[in-house]
């Protein structure tokens, strides 16, 4: 960076090298060049010479003033016009940054994705800070009072093997950067309550020729959790509103869900599950498209990504569910 150059003087920023976006700032340049009394001192921002708001302070120092500085990052350097020198002499350079102090982290969420071996904690960091912001995730056992801290710049994966202090914990997040520090509210968790089942995947769909044609969606999960509640949402691709079916599911076999759909229309399906009665849902599965036929022939669609563990499983039963209409987005 610009800060690694050999300096013949000194450049500094007031109030600081990292400052709040929108502030007025002063950049000072002081030459210290052998046998050079600078006739002029010049400032450059990102390689472009500044022409205004430069004040000579004394024989070796000049100040550049910026009002309402809004750039997240800039490389500044200054030069001297030395008599008897044919070109400007570099004095020094500095990278400057503007941004915001962190917001209070909120919506702290910790989940354990089945088979992952990790507890994943996320949070809403708030508005963009533009500057390097670090987060310390505090995990305190409510049984042993032991506290562990994890440093990260976004989310954190904590090995469940390291959670030796029982099942109940307090989790909170501290956000800090050069401009400030904030701390979230404490989240109380029980490890058994935050498990999210292994992802549910739609494998294929078929429309059966019958008096009233029906579409069967085949879907499955590798979860070992016994009591699982799922939702499948679907809509015509031209629609805004989702329809949602709810299921109480036992994944000892591939699930089949029946739908009575309009002919010759492209539909999109997604599924998600949670451990029954718990708080957190899986994210919605990837989009599965199926176009219903114009008339009677049987049509089969397959998922874009057809995992091998879905192959060769026999259909053991058909699940049915309750139909609701859903305008909700993804719920975590």
């Amino acid at each position: 960076g610009i800060t690694n150059i050999n300096c013949s003087g000194h450049i500094w920023v007031e109030p600081a090298t990292i400052f709040k976006m929108g502030m007025n700032i002063s950049i000072y340049c002081q030459a210290a060049i052998k046998n050079c009394q600078p006739r002029k001192l010049h400032f450059y921002k990102n390689g472009i010479k500044e022409r205004f708001q430069i004040t000579r302070i004394n024989k070796t120092t000049a100040r550049l003033w910026y009002k309402n500085f809004l750039e997240p990052h800039a490389s500044m350097y200054c030069t001297a016009e030395c008599p008897k020198h044919f070109q400007e002499t570099l004095i020094c350079g500095k990278d400057i940054s503007s941004g915001y102090p962190p917001d209070i982290p909120d919506e702290v969420t910790c989940v354990i994705y089945e088979y992952s071996g990790n507890m994943t904690c996320t949070w809403n960091a708030g508005k963009l800070t533009y500057i390097d912001t670090k987060y310390v995730v505090h995990v305190k056992s409510l049984e042993t009072e032991e506290e562990q801290q994890y440093l990260t710049s976004s989310y954190i994966n904590i090995s469940t093997d390291s959670l030796q202090g029982g099942k109940k914990y307090l989790v909170w997040v501290q956000a800090a950067n050069a401009l400030g520090m904030e701390e979230s509210k404490q989240l109380q968790i029980h490890l058994d309550d935050i498990v999210i089942p292994s992802a549910a995947v739609i494998s294929r769909a078929e429309t059966i020729n019958a008096t009233v044609p029906k579409t069967i969606i085949y879907w499955d999960s590798q979860t070992t959790i016994e009591k699982v509640s799922c939702e499948m949402r679907y809509k015509a691709t031209t629609n805004q509103t989702w329809n949602v079916k709810e299921f109480d599911t036992n994944f000892t076999y591939v699930q089949q869900s029946e739908f009575y759909l309009e002919p010759n229309i492209k539909y999109v399906f997604q599924v998600r599950c949670q451990e029954t009665g718990k708080r957190y849902w899986q994210p919605w599965s990837s989009l599965f498209f199926h176009k219903t036929p114009e008339t009677v022939p049987q049509v089969t669609s397959k998922a874009f990504q057809h995992d091998t563990w879905n192959s060769g499983l026999t259909v053991a039963s058909i699940s049915t569910g309750h139909l609701t209409s859903d305008n909700r987005g993804d719920i975590g």
Epitope: A32, I33, N35, Q37, R39, R56, K59, C82, P83
Partner: antibody, heavy 116, light 107 residues
Framework: QVHLVQSGTEVRKPGASVKVSCKVS????????IHWVRQAPGKGLEWMGG????????IYAQRFQGRITLPEDTSTDTAYMDLVNLRSEDTAVYFC?????????WGQGSLVIVSS | DIQMTQSPSTLSASVGDRVTITCRAS??????LAWYQQKPGKAPKLLIY???SLESGVPSRFSGSGSGTDFTLTISGLQPDDFATYYC?????????FGQGTKVEIK
């Protein structure tokens, strides 16, 4: 172009002090390093002191230390040379000059006569 | 302090002559050496800086050479206006020091 205009001849008694002025034009005093050089009658040039831009300070020749000060008035772009406790051997022409590494602009010189 | 020794002290020459003045420093100067011309009752005038660079407006018959401790001012083809006293000066370290001067007079 730098132009340096100095004050006129001064006559002083031994033990007195003298203040020679050097008015700068073409540039501001903040853009120039002013040095002072003297020349006794029939003798060579002798550097007395001046501003060192590398270290940002005024440096004096050892033999004048304690007797010389080099104040500046940036509001009028005038540099001064104060020499106290004058002796007869201080009789000389005193030049202000700008150090643009080396001395490239010179005042016309100010004659100081020290005589009882 | 760095001592600057010029030779000769006086030099008699005629118009058109090639004149050489030498200056020796008591320690190496990294080429921070200047040459001045001074006429009676006038301020010195810069001729050469950084040992060999010609000051703007100075006639090309003046040239400087040398490095380290030994330096030379040469006037190739002396003109009537060149009869004056010449000084070398080091500006490598403080205090700045001058040679004692070389007077170039008419033979």
């Amino acid at each position: 172009q730098v132009h340096l205009v100095q004050s006129g001849t001064e006559v002083r008694k031994p033990g007195a002090s003298v203040k020679v002025s050097c008015k700068v034009s073409g540039y501001t005093l903040n853009e120039l390093a002013i040095h002072w050089v003297r020349q006794a009658p029939g003798k060579g040039l002798e550097w007395m002191g001046g501003f060192d831009p590398e270290h940002g300070e005024i440096i004096y020749a050892q033999r004048f230390q304690g007797r010389i000060t080099l104040p500046e008035d940036t509001s009028t772009d005038t540099a001064y040379m104060d020499l106290v406790n004058l002796r007869s051997e201080d009789t000389a022409v005193y030049f202000c000059t700008t150090e643009a590494a080396p001395f490239d602009y010179w005042g016309q010189g100010s004659l100081v006569i020290v005589s009882s | 302090d760095i001592q600057m020794t010029q030779s000769p002290s006086t030099l008699s020459a005629s118009v058109g002559d090639r004149v050489t003045i030498t200056c020796r420093a008591s320690q190496s100067l990294s080429n921070w050496l200047a040459w001045y011309q001074q006429k009676p009752g006038k301020a010195p005038k810069l001729l050469i800086y950084k040992a060999s660079s010609l000051e703007s407006g100075v006639p090309s018959r003046f040239s400087g050479s040398g490095s380290g401790t030994d330096f030379t001012l040469t006037i190739s083809g002396l003109q009537p206006d060149d009869f004056a006293t010449y000084y070398c000066q080091q500006y490598d370290i403080y205090p700045r020091t001058f040679g004692q001067g070389t007077k170039v007079e008419i033979k």
